[in-house]
Interface confidence: low
């Protein structure tokens, strides 16, 4: 005997005994393959959850996470809290870099900014939450402009010059 | 249009029983059929249907216990074993609709009464 | 499986008033809900189809409404014909319920 629900395409389902008819699969429903027995309950995006594209009555609605989240697993099947730059992953959840460090990656920790002093270089650009200090130059020994001598530094290298 | 059923009698449990439905003023091939029953004092209750095209469905507490078929102009309901539970009055019933999904009885008969006793 | 439970199982109205009766689906029926008055030793008599359309040649004081798994048929102006079973029908499935009929509501009109 010929299956009647082979008749029934995408969008409906093979719901009524009655002259082979089909019926369309109800409101927050789908079904994605011709011949369905029944419609399949349309996933609801809550939560950490969002809709990227609305259920129709040939596709289930396809969800996304919410600012801070990341998808993980086929579908997005879940949501994983996914901080910005400046911010930290804690058991508490994401938490914004504490004054003198920064996270400059959309992972990972905090990281102290770089201490410019201890390479002898002045700072150039101030550190923020989100990028790390930005050292100048190792200074010379003098200001541009201040009168001076150049004399050679015994043992020097050639071209190393010391202000007197 | 009309919908007659008869065959109904009384029977001893385990002898097979077969009620008829014939039907005038339309025809078997535009109609789905349904057979209802009715326990004394009770409420309604489906057994299966015969769609246009001769494929039958039936209640799941049904399956096995009865056979529905059909000719031309007429439905036909085998009670396969019947027990003291399945004396009711049989109705048999015509599926009408619209719109693919829309669907509802439109034409019942009168019934017939199936006493199943010892 | 689709279940329908009807309420009340019983219900006594004075002539001229009002009688609702409650049929709820265990899932959506999408508005493929039906209504049956049926009287002693008669046949059930299609009164609504499609949970709100009236069939033909039923009183326009008999109103079906409601969508999803909640239906309702009100009888406005009670009159003493309308003493009877009242029963809903849900649309019907391939994999189909055990009864596709409500468990019926006897009207009782004084």
């Known amino acids: 005997v010929p299956d009647p629900c082979s008749n029934c395409s995408a969008g409906t389902f093979c719901g009524k005994n009655i002259q082979e008819l089909c019926m369309p699969c109800p409101s927050n429903s789908f079904s994605s393959t011709s011949g369905q027995k029944a419609c399949n309950v349309c996933r609801k995006c809550e939560g950490v959850f969002r809709t990227k594209k609305e259920c129709s009555s040939t596709s289930n609605a396809v969800c996304e996470c919410v600012p801070g989240f990341r998808c993980l697993g086929a579908g997005c099947a879940m949501c994983e809290e996914y901080c910005q730059q400046g911010q930290e992953l804690t058991q508490e959840g994401c938490k914004d870099c504490s004054f003198g460090t920064f996270n400059d990656e959309e992972h990972g920790v905090c990281r102290p900014w770089t201490d410019c002093s201890l390479a002898g270089k002045p700072v150039l650009m101030n550190g923020t939450k989100a990028r790390d200090v930005v050292c100048g130059p190792r200074p010379t020994d003098f200001s541009p402009g201040t009168p001076s001598t150049t004399m050679p530094v015994p043992g020097g290298e050639p071209g190393h010059t010391s202000h007197v | 249009q009309s919908v007659e059923e008869s065959g109904g009698r009384l029977v001893t449990p385990g002898t097979p029983l077969t009620l008829t439905c014939t039907v005038s003023?339309?025809?078997?091939?535009?109609?789905?059929m349904s057979w209802v029953r009715q326990a004394p004092g009770k409420g309604l209750e489906w057994i299966g249907i015969?769609?246009?095209?001769?494929i039958t469905y039936y209640a799941s507490w049904a399956k096995g216990r009865f056979t529905i078929s059909k000719t031309s102009t007429m439905v036909d309901l085998k009670i396969t074993s019947p027990t003291t539970e399945d004396t009711a009055t049989y109705f048999c019933?015509?599926?009408?609709?619209?719109?693919?999904?829309?669907?509802?009885?439109?034409?019942w008969g009168l019934g017939t009464l199936v006493t199943v006793s010892s | 499986a689709i279940e329908l439970t009807q309420t009340p199982s019983s219900v006594s109205a004075a002539v001229g008033g009002t009688v609702t009766i409650n049929c709820q689906a265990s899932?959506?029926?999408?508005?493929?809900l039906a209504w049956y008055q049926q009287k002693p030793g008669q046949p059930p008599k299609l009164l609504i189809y499609?949970?709100?359309y009236l069939a033909s040649g039923v009183p326009s004081r008999f109103k079906g409404s409601g969508s999803g798994t909640e239906y309702t048929l009100t009888i406005s102006g009670v009159q003493s014909a309308d003493a009877a079973t009242y029963y809903c029908q849900s649309a019907f499935y391939v994999s189909s319920s055990d009864n596709a009929f409500g468990g019926g509501t006897e009207v009782v009109v004084k």
């Open positions: 015969i769609s246009t095209s001769g």
């Open positions: 499609a949970a709100s």
């Open positions: 003023g339309f025809s078997l091939s535009s109609y789905a």
């Open positions: 899932e959506s029926i999408a508005s493929n």
């Open positions: 019933a015509r599926l009408n609709g619209f719109d693919d999904y829309v669907r509802y009885f439109d034409f």
